[in-house]
Each structure stands twice: as structure tokens, then as C-alpha cells.
């Protein structure tokens, strides 16, 4: 496939707002089960100094826990360091900020390295829209139909949400 | 315009090596991942290899992982498969394929033919 391209502009302060997770995925099936370490939700998103501040929400003890992350800046552009659960290469795969963003992570915890895909959304109603850019992301990276679990209200801490 | 060009294909024995190259232009090839995929005959096109934006991670079909090696050179704009122990099953035309922000890239491919 050819043709023009054209590569989005404005930074990443247009991320910032309130957004929605709709799938995951991971080549460690436990780490996106529920009570899985990576089976968490966005809540919202604000960026600051070209790093990326999120809320998510963690399911704990039949309630939704929302904890501040930040992933950090890196020299590339898309690439950020994120702290949670060892550490993160966070990659912004594919954005448009007024309604889609799909980010994989390389997580290392002691010596397991581990692949996360996340798909979030900023109208749960077009969540269907996305999901086969995010099937062709994740068999990009290595990741299988069968390896992707797409969310349901249940399961996204929709209720913990103000 | 967004093209990606393979090369390096060709006719080798069983166990020999060869290394692919995918010429990139028309995007910022620093800013995304790259992928290889192959096709072999009568079969469906199948995933090989991943390597993120920056070259320090990739990940590997089982089929060949221990044998083929993903590597990028961002000044250059390319990106290789060095593909070493190579089977017979290994023939396939090769493509290397990015996505730009919602639409798939594929280059035309190239021809790997293992065979004694």
C-alpha cells in the first residue's frame, strides 16, 4: 500500500482528558486476567513537560482503587519510562487523540520480559471502530487474536468513575 | 509517499544464512515500530519478527526464534531480518510492514528459496 501521509500534529497535550480502556492484551495471559498486575483502566490522562500523567483505575478487594502514574519522557518521541511493576518501555503505537490511542509497554519485572497492548477510547459507543486497529497492532507485534481480551462495563471500574 | 523496499532475497542450502534489508522513505522511521512478515507458497501470509521504534526490543515468531535477528539503523533508514540455520521451511517471500497511524504499509517482498 502507498499513498500520502501525513504524520498528526500538536503535541501531547491533546491526549489530555478523560478516556476509556476497551481491550488488552499480553503474551503473558496472567498479567491481563482479572487481578492481573496489568489489568487496569484509564481513567484520564494529562501531559506536562512532554511527560504523560495518567489516572487508572485497579480493581482491589471487589472495589476500584485510582492511583496517579507518570511516564517519563524519553530522547524518542513516542517512547516513554514508565515505573509500575519493574519497568516499562512504553510506546505510543497509534493515536488520534480526539478518539483513539493504542500503546504496547516492554515490561521487565526481575528477569521475565513481558508484552502489554492497551487500547483506550474516548466514546465507549465507537469502542467497535478501534478494535481492528488494535488487532492489526498487536499482530504486528507478536500478539495473537486469541491473546486480546476486550473489556467489558463490568470489568472497566465504569462505577468508580466521578 | 510512504515506501518500504526489500532486498536481500535468494537461493541458499539448508543451514546457510542470509540477511534481509527494508529500505524505508516517505515517513519519520524513527518514530515507529517495523515488523517482518512471510508468505510461502500456498500458504497464509504469517507473522516473523517485531522490532520497536528505538531497536532495543523485538520479539520473535517461535519458528524462528533462536535463528533470525531483528536490527534496525535509523540513520539509515532500514531495517534487517539476519536470518541464520535456514530450513527449508523457511522459503517464503518476505515483507517488512509498518503502520503509519491507522493504515498498514507493506513493502512488495522478497524471495527466500532454501533448498539443497
Known amino acids: 500500500q502507498e499513498g500520502n501521509h501525513e504524520e498528526p500534529q500538536g503535541g501531547l497535550e491533546e491526549l489530555s482528558g478523560r478516556w476509556h480502556s476497551v481491550a488488552l492484551a499480553s503474551n503473558k495471559s496472567d498479567l491481563i486476567k482479572p487481578w492481573g498486575h496489568f489489568r487496569v483502566f484509564i481513567h484520564s490522562m494529562s501531559a506536562k513537560d512532554g511527560n504523560l500523567h495518567g489516572d487508572i483505575l485497579i480493581p482491589q478487594d471487589g472495589q476500584c482503587e485510582k492511583v496517579s502514574l507518570t511516564a517519563f519522557k524519553t530522547a524518542t518521541s513516542n517512547k516513554f519510562d514508565l515505573e509500575y511493576w519493574g519497568h516499562n518501555d512504553l510506546y505510543l503505537a497509534e493515536v488520534d487523540p480526539k478518539s483513539y490511542l493504542i500503546l504496547y509497554m516492554i515490561n521487565q519485572y526481575n528477569d521475565d520480559t513481558s508484552l502489554v497492548a492497551h487500547l483506550m477510547v474516548r466514546d465507549l459507543s465507537r469502542q467497535q471502530d478501534f478494535l481492528p486497529a488494535f488487532e492489526s497492532v498487536c499482530e504486528d507485534i507478536g500478539l495473537h487474536k486469541d491473546q486480546i481480551v476486550v473489556l467489558s462495563d463490568d470489568d472497566r471500574c465504569q462505577g468508580s468513575r466521578d | 509517499a510512504v515506501q518500504l523496499v526489500e532486498s536481500g532475497g535468494g537461493l541458499v542450502q539448508p543451514g546457510g544464512s542470509l540477511r534481509l534489508s527494508c529500505a524505508a522513505s516517505?515517513?519519520?522511521?524513527?518514530?515507529?515500530?517495523m515488523s517482518w512478515y512471510r508468505q510461502a507458497p500456498g500458504k497464509e501470509r504469517e507473522w516473523v519478527a517485531f522490532i520497536t521504534s528505538t531497536g532495543s526490543s523485538t520479539n520473535y515468531a517461535n519458528s524462528v526464534k533462536g535463528r533470525f535477528t531483528a536490527s534496525r539503523d535509523n540513520a539509515k533508514n532500514t531495517v534487517y531480518l539476519q536470518m541464520n540455520s535456514l530450513k527449508p521451511e523457511d522459503t517464503a517471500v518476505y515483507y517488512c510492514k509498518t503502520r503509519l497511524w491507522g493504515n498498514d504499509y507493506w513493502g512488495k517482498g522478497t524471495l527466500v528459496t532454501v533448498s539443497s
Open positions: 516517505g515517513f519519520t522511521f524513527s518514530n515507529y515500530y
